[in-house]
C-alpha cells in the first residue's frame, strides 16, 4: 500500500570498494523522489541524499566513521512535489537494505604494482598502498593501515620468455624474490583477506614487466 502512484524501492544493493560505499536501488523514479537513512544497529537514523531522483546514494562518509560496525540503510519514497505525503499507515513508504559491515564486505580494489627494483639476483616488488577514505586523526588511512596483517598480497611472477609461473605471499606491501640473472620477469599481484568468507580476493593487478618504466636495475 502507500500513497497513490508511489512505489517502494527494491533491490537495495551495497556497492563498496576499498570502503567507497554506495547504496543502489530500483526503480528509476516516475513522479516520486527518494531519501535515504542509515544507522548502525544501536545508533540513530541519519538522513542522506534528500528528495533525490537518483537511484544511488554515496554513504561513504557515514560508514568510514567505524568500518567494523554493521550498518542498515532504508530508502523512503515520496510523491514528487508532495514530500509531506505519507502512506496509508501514516508513514512514508520505505524499504530496508541488507545489513552491511564494511570491514568484512567491502570489495578489495584492483591493486597496483608501484615499483620493482633488481639488485643482482633479487628483485624487490612493491605494491602501492592505496589510500582509503577512512580517517583517523584527520588523516586518510591506507588499506594496510585499516586491515593490518589481515591483508595479504599474492605475487605471480614469470620469465618473459616462458609461461611457467611462480608465486610468493607477503603480509607487508613488499616482496623480495630470487630471479635468474639476465632474465626479464613479469609481475602481477592480488590482494587477499584470509579471514573473510566473502569478497576475499581482489582482481589481479595489471601486469608489469622488467625492461619497462617502473623498474630499476642495479648490479
Amino acid at each position: 500500500s502507500g500513497t497513490t502512484n508511489t512505489v517502494a524501492a527494491y533491490n537495495l544493493t551495497w556497492k563498496s570498494t576499498n570502503f567507497k560505499t554506495i547504496l543502489e536501488w530500483e526503480p528509476k523514479p516516475v513522479n516520486q523522489v527518494y531519501t535515504v537513512q542509515i544507522s548502525t544497529k544501536s545508533g540513530d537514523w541519519k538522513s542522506k541524499c534528500f528528495y533525490t531522483t537518483d537511484t544511488e546514494c554515496d554513504l561513504t562518509d557515514e560508514i568510514v566513521k567505524d568500518v567494523k560496525q554493521t550498518y542498515l540503510a532504508r530508502v523512503f519514497s515520496y510523491p514528487a512535489g508532495n514530500v509531506e505525503s505519507t502512506g496509508s499507515a501514516g508513514e512514508p513508504l520505505y524499504e530496508n537494505s541488507p545489513e552491511f559491515t564494511p570491514y568484512l564486505e567491502t570489495n578489495l580494489g584492483q591493486p597496483t604494482i608501484q615499483s620493482f627494483e633488481q639488485v643482482g639476483t633479487k628483485v624487490n616488488v612493491t605494491v602501492e598502498d592505496e589510500r582509503t577514505l577512512v580517517r583517523r586523526n584527520n588523516t586518510f588511512l591506507s588499506l594496510r593501515d585499516v586491515f593490518g596483517k589481515d591483508l595479504i598480497y599474492t605475487l605471480y611472477y614469470w620469465k618473459s620468455s616462458s609461461s611457467g609461473k611462480k608465486t610468493a605471499k607477503t603480509n607487508t606491501n613488499e616482496f623480495l624474490i630470487d630471479v635468474d640473472k639476465g632474465e626479464n620477469y613479469c609481475f602481477s599481484v592480488q590482494a587477499v583477506i584470509p579471514s573473510r568468507t566473502v569478497n576475499r580476493k581482489s582482481t589481479d593487478s595489471p601486469v608489469e614487466c622488467m625492461g619497462q618504466e617502473k623498474g630499476e636495475f642495479r648490479e
Epitope: 599474492t154 609461473k165 610468493a168 607477503t170 592480488q190 576475499r200
Partner: antibody
C-alpha cells in the same frame, strides 16, 4: 558444511594418464586457492601445485610442470589434476586442499593412484 | 627453492611429556609457515598458522614459535590422541615445501 571429495584414482599402467577430481561443497572454490598434495606410501607430504579458480592462474612444483595440469570448473565447483606419462614413483594418495592464503584449512580424504604394470 | 629440514624424524614420548619439533628453512620463509597433524589413513589437520597462531578448535597445549628460518612446534603436555605424524609447511613462496615429518610414538 565445507567438504572436499577427491575421485578418479585407481590402477594405471606406466605411461598412462589419469584425471583426478576434487568436488567442493559448502563454499565457492573461486574465492580460494586450491592445491593438490600427494603422499607416497609410508612417505611424507609433497606439494604438487595450486590453482586460483577465479582467474585460472596455476603454479606447480617444477618437477611436475611438464606432466601434470591443474584446472578448475567454477560452474561445477570442482578442481582437477590431469596426470600424464605416469611412472611407478607417482604411486601415492592424492589430496586436494583449500588455501585461505594464510593456511590450508580443509583437506579431502584423498584418492589412491597406483601406477603398475 | 626453500628446503624445510624437520627434526627429529621420530621420537618416543609418554603421556604428559613436553614435546618439541623443529623446522629449519634453507633461507628466510617470512611468516607463512604452518604445522599439520596427520594420523594413519587420514588427511592432515591444521594446527598452527603464521608460525605462531593457533587454528580454531585446536587445544591450547599446541603452540608454535619462531621466525625467519627457525620454527618450532611444541606440545606442552602430550595426550593419547596426540600420537601422530607432524609436518611443517612453508607456503610463502613456490614451490611450497613440507618438512619430512616427525612421527610421535608412545614410549
Amino acid at each position: 558444511e565445507v567438504q572436499l571429495v577427491e575421485s578418479g584414482g585407481g590402477l594405471v599402467q606406466p605411461g598412462g594418464s589419469l584425471r583426478l577430481s576434487c568436488a567442493a561443497s559448502g563454499f565457492n572454490i573461486k574465492d580460494y586457492y586450491m592445491h593438490w598434495v600427494r603422499q607416497a606410501p609410508g612417505k611424507g607430504l609433497e606439494w604438487v601445485g595450486w590453482i586460483d579458480p577465479e582467474n585460472g592462474n596455476t603454479i606447480y612444483d617444477p618437477k611436475f610442470q611438464d606432466r601434470f595440469t591443474i584446472s578448475a570448473d567454477t560452474s561445477k565447483n570442482t578442481a582437477y589434476l590431469q596426470m600424464n606419462s605416469l611412472r611407478a614413483e607417482d604411486t601415492a594418495v592424492y589430496y586436494c586442499a583449500r588455501d585461505t592464503a594464510a593456511y590450508f584449512d580443509y583437506w579431502g580424504q584423498g584418492t589412491l593412484v597406483t601406477v603398475s604394470s | 627453492d626453500i628446503q624445510m629440514t624437520q627434526s627429529p624424524s621420530s621420537l618416543s614420548a609418554s603421556v604428559g611429556d613436553r614435546v618439541t619439533i623443529t623446522c629449519k628453512g634453507s633461507r628466510d620463509t617470512t611468516s607463512f609457515v604452518s604445522w599439520y597433524q596427520q594420523k594413519p589413513g587420514k588427511a592432515p589437520k591444521l594446527l598452527i598458522y603464521y608460525a605462531t597462531s593457533l587454528a580454531d578448535g585446536v587445544p591450547s597445549r599446541f603452540s608454535g614459535s619462531g621466525s625467519g628460518t627457525d620454527f618450532t612446534l611444541t606440545i606442552s603436555s602430550l595426550q593419547p590422541e596426540d600420537f601422530a605424524t607432524y609436518y611443517c609447511l612453508q607456503h610463502g613462496e613456490s614451490p611450497f615445501t613440507f618438512g619430512q615429518g616427525t612421527k610421535v610414538e608412545i614410549k
